[in-house]
C-alpha cells in the first residue's frame, strides 16, 4: 500500500523505541566507525523528523524515501572522508546508486577494539545510571561489528540483554548470576549474525532463486504438513523480510516480520502442528520462536515421489510450463519426506533433477532418459554421510581442541595463502561441529553438521573477499553455494604454495600468556601450529604432533616459574631451535 | 472395504455451480491419481481430468478453466468444482482410481456408483 | 484426440467368439496404453484390460487384448451369458489432459 509518508507510516507501526533503536543499527551497520554519540545525535534527529510527519504526513521532505533521508543524514557527518576514505564518494551519486554504494562499503572485518568486559560491579552501575544509554551501547556496539546482523533479532538480543542485568544487577551473587547469560548472549549473538551472514551472502551473490530455493527447502522440512502454496507464500514474505534487511532496509524488515509472524500464528492449523508455544509469546520472542521452531512430524502415508518426478509422463510438459515452480514442488516434496537431510543436500539433488530434465526433455525418448534419476541421488547423499561419520569418529577420540588442531592443519594445508587469523577463526568455528552435531542421533547429524559448516565456510568466504589471496578459495565460494562445503572437502595440498620464511618471532612467547583465558590460550597455539603448517607445508601429523606437544610443555613449564620472562626468553629459544630441527626447517 | 462414494449431484440452473465430493474408504486417496468421467443418458463415458499423488491436475481441453479437481487428504475425500454449468454438462459424474499415480494411463480401476447432475432451468 | 470404436452394435450368441476393434488418431503413450472396460446399465464401468494385453485382477482369462500404437483389439474366447454389455477404449496419450474414451460397442444377444 502506497503510504503519503513512509517515515510515518514506519513510526507508527512499529512505535518510537523500536523505531530509534532500528534507526541506530541501521546507522551503526553502514557508518562502523562513527562514534556512538555521533549515532545517537543522528538517530535523535531522525526520529524528532519523523515525529513531525506522523503529525502532518504532508509536510516538507515527509514524503521522501527512507533511503534518501537515511543517506542525506548519514552524509551530514563531518568526518566521513577522513574516517571512511572513498565511502564519502558515495554522498555524490543519487538513490537508489547512493544505498548501493554504502551497502558495498559495509566492512566484515571492522577494525575495531575488542570489546572488553568491565567488571560486574562496573556494568550494573552504568546499567542502574542510564538504561537507555546502556542498552543503545549494546546495540550499537554490536552493529558496527556485525554489519548484517538481523536487526529484529538485534531488538530480541538486546531485550534479554536488558532482562539480564535486571534480574542479577539485584542478585545476591551478580557475576555469577549475570556472567553465565552474558555468554550465551555473546556465543548465540555469533552464532545469530554468522547465520545471516550467510542469508546476506545467498541473496546478493547468487540471487533471490537461490535464497527462495533454501527457504522452500528448510519450510518444507520445518513444515511437513503445510500445503505447497503455503509454503510458497511463506518463502515469498520470508524472503521479502531477509531481501530488506539485507539492503539496509531495517524499518520495513522489522514491520514485515511481525506481520509475516502474526500471519502465521494465526494460520498455525493449516502450517504446523508446534506453533503453539510460540504464538503465545510477546513479539519479539514470537518470531525468534517462529525461526527456531523444532520440524512438525511427517504426515502419514505420503506417496512415492517417483510417481509424479520420475514414473509419469507428463514430466517434461509441467517442467516446460513452469519450470521453477515444478522444481519448487519437487524441492518441497523431498524436502518435506527428509528432515534427516542437509539443507544444501536438498538443494544438490534438485540441482541435479533440473540438470537432468534439461537434458532428457530435449532427447528423443525422455522418460528412458530421466527414468534412473534417482540412481543419480545415491552418490550425493552418501557423501555428506561418509564425512559426517569420520568426522565425528575423529571428534569423539580426539576433544574438540584437538579435532579443531587438525582441522586447522587441514584446512592451512589447502589453502596456505589465508591469512592466519582468519584460518585460525574459521577452523575453530569448523571444529565446534563436533560438540555442536555429533551428539545427535544419526537422523538429526546431516542438517546440523551440514548447514553449521555452510554458516562457517561462508565466513571464510566474506572475509576472503576483502582481501582476495587465494584463487582457489575464490573458486569454491564463487562457484556454487551448495557446494562450497564439497568444494573446499575436495581440496588437497596446495602444491604451488611457496613455504613461508621462517620468523623466530612469529614464535616468540611472552608471560602475558600466562594470565590468558583458556580459550585464548588456545588461540595463541592454534596460531602457533598454523604458522608452522605454513613454513613447512609437507611436515606430518606426527611431526607436528610432537612440536605442538613441546609447546605446550613449554608454556605449562614457564607459567610455573618464578622468573617467568627469563623462563620464556631462554626456553622458548630452545624450542625454536629443537622445532626447527624436528620439522627440519 | 475398498470403496468410492460420490454425493453432490443434483438439479442446477444453466449457469449455476456445483462442487461434487467422491469419498474414499479402505485406502488413502493419495496413494494413487484419482480422476473423473461423466456419461451423459446414453452416451459415451467422457473423461474430465485427474489429480495425480502429488496434486498435480489435468483437464481435458473441454474442461479446464469450468471444473476444478482437488482433494482434502485429511478427509479422504476428492472433489470436482463445476461452475458455469450448462445443459451439455447433465450426466451421472464418476470419480475413479487410476493404476498410475503420477498420471493418467486411462486405467481406472476403481469407480464409484456416480452422482447425477441435471442442468436445466 | 479420437477413440474410434467398431461396430458400434454386435449381436452374437452363447460360446461364440467376438472381436471389437479400437482405433486412436494418434498412437498411445508407449504404444500401449490402452484399456479396455466393461460396463453394464445402472453399474460403472469395469476395467478389464490395461496396457493393451495385461489382464486386470478378476477378469476371466477369456478376455484378452492386443495391437500398439494406433490399432487395438479386446477378443472374449467364448461368449457367456454375463458378458452381454456395452465395451468401451480408452486411450492415455502423451498428456494426461489427453485420455479419451471410445464411444462404445453395444454386445447384445443374438
Known amino acids: 500500500d502506497a503510504h503519503k509518508s513512509e517515515v510515518a507510516h514506519r513510526f507508527k507501526d512499529l512505535g518510537e523505541e523500536n523505531f530509534k533503536a532500528l534507526v541506530l543499527i541501521a546507522f551503526a551497520q553502514y557508518l562502523q566507525q562513527c562514534p556512538f554519540e555521533d549515532h545517537v545525535k543522528l538517530v535523535n534527529e531522525v526520529t524528532e523528523f519523523a515525529k513531525t510527519c506522523v503529525a502532518d504526513e504532508s509536510a516538507e521532505n515527509c514524503d521522501k524515501s527512507l533511503h534518501t533521508l537515511f543517506g542525506d543524514k548519514l552524509c551530514t557527518v563531518a568526518t566521513l572522508r577522513e574516517t571512511y576514505g572513498e565511502m564519502a564518494d558515495c554522498c555524490a551519486k543519487q538513490e537508489p546508486e547512493r544505498n548501493e554504494c554504502f551497502l558495498q562499503h559495509k566492512d566484515d572485518n571492522p577494525n575495531l577494539p575488542r570489546l572488553v568486559r568491565p567488571e560486574v560491579d562496573v556494568m550494573c552501575t552504568a546499567f542502574h545510571d542510564n538504561e537507555e544509554t546502556f542498552l543503545k551501547k549494546y546495540l550499537y556496539e554490536i552493529a558496527r561489528r556485525h554489519p548484517y546482523f538481523y536487526a529484529p533479532e538485534l531488538l530480541f538480543f538486546a531485550k534479554r540483554y536488558k532482562a539480564a542485568f535486571t534480574e542479577c544487577c539485584q542478585a545476591a551473587d551478580k557475576a555469577a548470576c549475570l556472567l553465565p547469560k552474558l555468554d550465551e548472549l555473546r556465543d548465540e549473538g555469533k552464532a545469530s549474525s554468522a547465520k545471516q551472514r550467510l542469508k546476506c551472502a545467498s541473496l546478493q551473490k547468487f540471487g533471490e532463486r537461490a535464497f527462495k530455493a533454501w527457504a522452500v527447502a528448510r519450510l518444507s522440512q520445518r513444515f511437513p504438513k503445510a500445503e505447497f502454496a503455503e509454503v510458497s507464500k511463506l518463502v515469498t514474505d520470508l524472503t521479502k523480510v531477509h531481501t530488506e534487511c539485507c539492503h539496509g532496509d531495517l524499518l520495513e524488515c522489522a514491520d514485515d516480520r511481525a506481520d509475516l509472524a502474526k500471519y502465521i500464528c494465526e494460520n498455525q492449523d493449516s502450517i504446523s502442528s508446534k506453533l503453539k508455544e510460540c504464538c503465545e509469546k510477546p513479539l519479539l520472542e514470537k518470531s525468534h520462536c517462529i525461526a527456531e521452531v523444532e520440524n512438525d512430524e511427517m504426515p502419514a502415508d505420503l506417496p512415492s515421489l517417483a510417481a509424479d518426478f520420475v514414473e509419469s509422463k507428463d514430466v517434461c510438459k509441467n517442467y516446460a510450463e513452469a519450470k521453477d515452480v515444478f522444481l519448487g514442488m519437487f524441492l518441497y516434496e523431498y524436502a518435506r519426506r527428509h528432515p534427516d537431510y542437509s539443507v544444501v543436500l536438498l538443494l544438490r539433488l534438485a540441482k541435479t533433477y533440473e540438470t537432468t530434465l534439461e537434458k532428457c526433455c530435449a532427447a528423443a525418448d525422455p522418460h528412458e532418459c530421466y527414468a534412473k534419476v534417482f540412481d543419480e541421488f545415491k552418490p550425493l547423499v552418501e557423501e555428506p554421510q561418509n564425512l559426517i561419520k569420520q568426522n565425528c569418529e575423529l571428534f569423539e577420540q580426539l576433544g574438540e581442541y584437538k579435532f579443531q588442531n587438525a582441522l586447522l592443519v587441514r584446512y592451512t594445508k589447502k589453502v596456505p595463502q589465508v591469512s592466519t587469523p582468519t584460518l585460525v577463526e574459521v577452523s575453530r568455528n569448523l571444529g565446534k561441529v563436533g560438540s555442536k552435531c555429533c551428539k545427535h542421533p544419526e537422523a538429526k547429524r546431516m542438517p546440523c553438521a551440514e548447514d553449521y559448516l555452510s554458516v562457517v565456510l561462508n565466513q571464510l568466504c566474506v572475509l576472503h573477499e576483502k582481501t582476495p589471496v587465494s584463487d582457489r578459495v575464490t573458486k569454491c565460494c564463487t562457484e556454487s553455494l551448495v557446494n562450497r562445503r564439497p568444494c573446499f572437502s575436495a581440496l588437497e595440498v596446495d602444491e604451488t604454495y611457496v613455504p613461508k620464511e621462517f620468523n623466530a618471532e612469529t614464535f616468540t612467547f611472552h608471560a602475558d600468556i600466562c594470565t590468558l583465558s583458556e580459550k585464548e590460550r588456545q588461540i595463541k597455539k592454534q596460531t602457533a601450529l598454523v604458522e608452522l603448517v605454513k613454513h613447512k607445508p609437507k611436515a606430518t601429523k606426527e611431526q607436528l604432533k610432537a612440536v605442538m606437544d613441546d609447546f605446550a610443555a613449554f608454556v605449562e613449564k614457564c607459567c610455573k616459574a618464578d622468573d617467568k620472562e627469563t623462563c620464556f626468553a631462554e626456553e622458548g629459544k630452545k624450542l625454536v631451535a629443537a622445532s626447527q630441527a624436528a620439522l627440519g626447517l | 472395504e475398498v470403496q468410492l462414494v460420490e454425493s453432490g449431484g443434483g438439479r442446477v440452473q444453466p449457469g449455476g455451480s456445483l462442487r461434487l465430493s467422491c469419498a474414499a474408504s479402505?485406502?488413502?486417496?493419495?496413494?494413487?491419481?484419482m480422476g473423473w468421467v461423466r456419461q451423459a443418458p446414453g452416451k459415451c463415458l467422457e473423461y474430465i481430468g485427474i489429480?495425480?499423488?502429488?496434486?498435480?491436475?489435468y483437464y481435458a481441453s473441454w474442461a479446464k478453466g469450468r471444473f476444478t479437481i482437488s482433494r482434502d487428504n485429511s478427509k479422504n475425500t476428492l472433489y470436482l468444482q463445476m461452475n458455469s454449468l450448462r445443459a451439455e454438462d447433465t450426466a451421472t459424474y464418476f470419480c475413479?482410481?487410476?493404476?498410475?499415480?503420477?498420471?493418467?494411463?486411462?486405467?481406472?480401476?476403481?469407480w464409484g456408483q456416480g452422482t447425477q447432475v441435471t442442468v436445466s432451468s | 484426440i479420437q477413440m474410434t470404436q467398431s461396430p458400434s452394435s454386435l449381436s452374437a450368441s452363447v460360446g461364440d467368439r467376438v472381436t471389437i476393434t479400437c482405433r486412436s488418431s494418434?498412437?498411445?503413450?508407449?504404444?500401449?496404453?490402452l484399456s479396455w472396460y466393461q460396463q453394464k446399465p445402472g453399474q460403472p464401468p469395469k476395467l478389464l484390460i490395461y496396457?493393451?494385453?495385461d489382464l486386470a485382477s478378476g477378469v476371466p482369462s477369456r478376455f484378452s487384448g492386443s495391437g500398439s500404437g494406433t490399432d487395438f483389439t479386446l477378443t472374449i474366447s467364448s461368449l457367456q451369458p454375463e458378458d452381454f454389455a456395452t465395451y468401451y477404449c480408452?486411450?492415455?496419450?502423451?498428456?494426461?489432459?489427453?485420455?479419451?474414451f471410445g464411444c462404445g460397442t453395444k454386445l447384445t444377444v443374438l
Open positions: 496396457d493393451a494385453s
Open positions: 480408452a486411450g492415455g496419450f502423451s498428456s494426461s489432459s489427453d485420455t479419451a
Open positions: 479402505g485406502f488413502s486417496l493419495s496413494s494413487n491419481a
Open positions: 489429480i495425480s499423488v502429488g496434486g498435480f491436475t
Open positions: 494418434e498412437s498411445v503413450y508407449s504404444n500401449n496404453q
Open positions: 475413479a482410481r487410476d493404476r498410475h499415480g503420477g498420471d493418467s494411463s486411462g486405467a481406472f480401476y476403481l
